[in-house]
């Protein structure tokens, strides 16, 4: 019987081809040269290797490149990428967007794995910032990618990249993230006219301050209730009834259905009941007529 560490006669691989799918693990180990594998990595993905056979091929590459694979190999990993651990990936230096796309394609249709998260982290850190092309690519594969970043990480997104962001990319963002993204969006879209500007900025308004909402109320934007409900409570509270009416336009009627939810509930509590009554929606809970409203925050500032 042939010793398992020696390649059987006539089985030495001259190239990476389909004949290897019949090789047992020990035969692959003994008969496939790691350097040959590295130079012909582009063929591996076209050959239906089993899960176990891919383990052997990975092991051979690990031995050849203990400090991490070169990008020429990484770009052609294909399904072998799914065998990589985050620790393996941390050794890589991935600079090409094409390489990133090739590896994301392998995981397409699946949730972001720890391997993919590590790959993206390595790539973005290597580039120094999240440029438009990268953001375009990442959000195409993972619409929720942007909202998975911390506010600190989002601060490295240049305003020009905001053009790549689609409304659905922001669905899972929290207020802290929108606080960072909104000023960038405002800068990115500043040269657009009123109605076009509102269409683009709408998804980011969860980070807008009061003064910007007041400005929008003067532009007949007809904000829908879904967008209004995502606004920062502290930004909505100072708005007058007239400003909210102008901001929402025909959608103002929707306030009644939302009167028990923030920020509408808190906003109602700050308005004079007289003013709320002018909307004719039956909103209740405003400040009764004849009551004096003291702004305690202002009083504290003066003392």
């Amino acid at each position: 019987e042939v010793e398992k560490t020696a390649c059987p006669s006539g089985k030495k691989a001259r190239e990476i081809d389909e004949s290897l799918i019949f090789y047992k693990k020990w035969e692959l180990e003994a008969c496939v040269d790691a350097a040959l594998l590295a130079t012909q990595m582009d063929r591996v993905n076209a050959i239906p290797f089993t899960y176990e056979q891919l383990d052997v091929l990975k092991h051979k590459l690990d031995e050849l490149y203990p400090q991490g694979y070169p990008e020429s190999v990484i770009q052609h990993l294909g399904y072998l990428f799914l065998k990589m651990s985050p620790e393996d990936i941390r050794k890589w230096n991935v600079t090409s967007l094409e390489t990133l796309k090739a590896l994301l394609e392998v995981n397409k249709g699946h949730e972001m794995s720890p391997q993919v998260a590590t790959l993206i982290d390595r790539f973005v850190k290597g580039r120094g910032q999240l440029d438009k092309d990268t953001l375009d690519t990442l959000t195409a594969f993972y619409p929720g990618y942007l909202c998975s970043l911390s506010p600190e990480e989002l601060s490295s997104v240049p305003p020009s990249s905001i053009w790549a962001v689609r409304p659905q990319d922001l669905d899972t963002c929290d207020p802290r993230q929108l606080d960072v993204l909104y000023p960038k969006a405002r800068l990115a879209f500043q040269n657009m006219n009123g109605s076009e500007y509102f269409v683009k900025i709408q998804s980011f308004l969860g980070g807008a301050p009061t003064e910007d909402l007041k400005a929008l109320s003067q532009q007949n934007v007809s904000m829908d209730l879904a967008t209004f409900m995502k606004l920062r409570t502290d930004a909505v509270l100072p708005l007058t009834v007239a400003e909210v009416q102008k901001l929402l336009g025909p959608h103002v009627e929707g306030l009644k259905a939302e009167e028990r939810h923030r920020p509408v509930r808190d906003w109602i509590l700050r308005q004079r009941q007289d003013d709320l009554d002018t909307l004719g929606l039956g909103l209740q809970g405003g400040i009764p007529n004849g009551y004096l409203v003291l702004d305690l925050s202002m009083q504290e500032a003066l003392s």
Epitope: F22, K24, K25, T50, Y51, E52, Q53
Partner: nanobody, 121 residues
């Protein structure tokens, strides 16, 4: 444990087509490569189509290349074999099998019971 059940076999005229299906139950097949084998009377089992665990790559021997197509749907736990331009020599019992090791017939973990395909005028 995985159970494989083939269907779709039958009698077909030369030049005709058949589509075989293989339904898996039990454990997930997502990490298994899948193969279709055939065995004609008095002959050994012959691999006619083979597909990787993620479905991205396939293998066919020269005897069926260009005529047979293997595909899989991991979500539905199904594997298919589309057979076109059938010839008399394609007559055999066709088996579906799952392997995590190699494409070698001896290395398959699970086999179906087989479905008869007869090509005759």
């Amino acid at each position: 444990e995985v159970q494989l059940v083939e269907s779709g076999g039958g009698l077909v005229q030369p030049g005709g087509s058949l589509r075989l299906s293989c339904a898996a139950s039990g454990n997930t097949l997502s990490r298994y490569n899948m193969g279709w084998f055939r065995q004609a009377p008095g002959k050994g089992r012959e691999l006619v189509a083979y597909i990787s665990w993620r479905g991205g790559s396939t293998y066919y021997p020269d005897s069926v290349e260009g005529r047979f197509t293997i595909s899989r749907d991991n979500a539905k736990r199904m594997v298919y074999l589309q057979m076109n331009s059938l010839r008399a020599e394609d007559t055999a019992v066709y088996y579906c099998a799952a392997s995590i090791k190699t494409a070698d017939p001896d290395d398959y973990d699970y086999w179906g019971q087989g479905t008869q395909v007869t090509v005759s005028s």
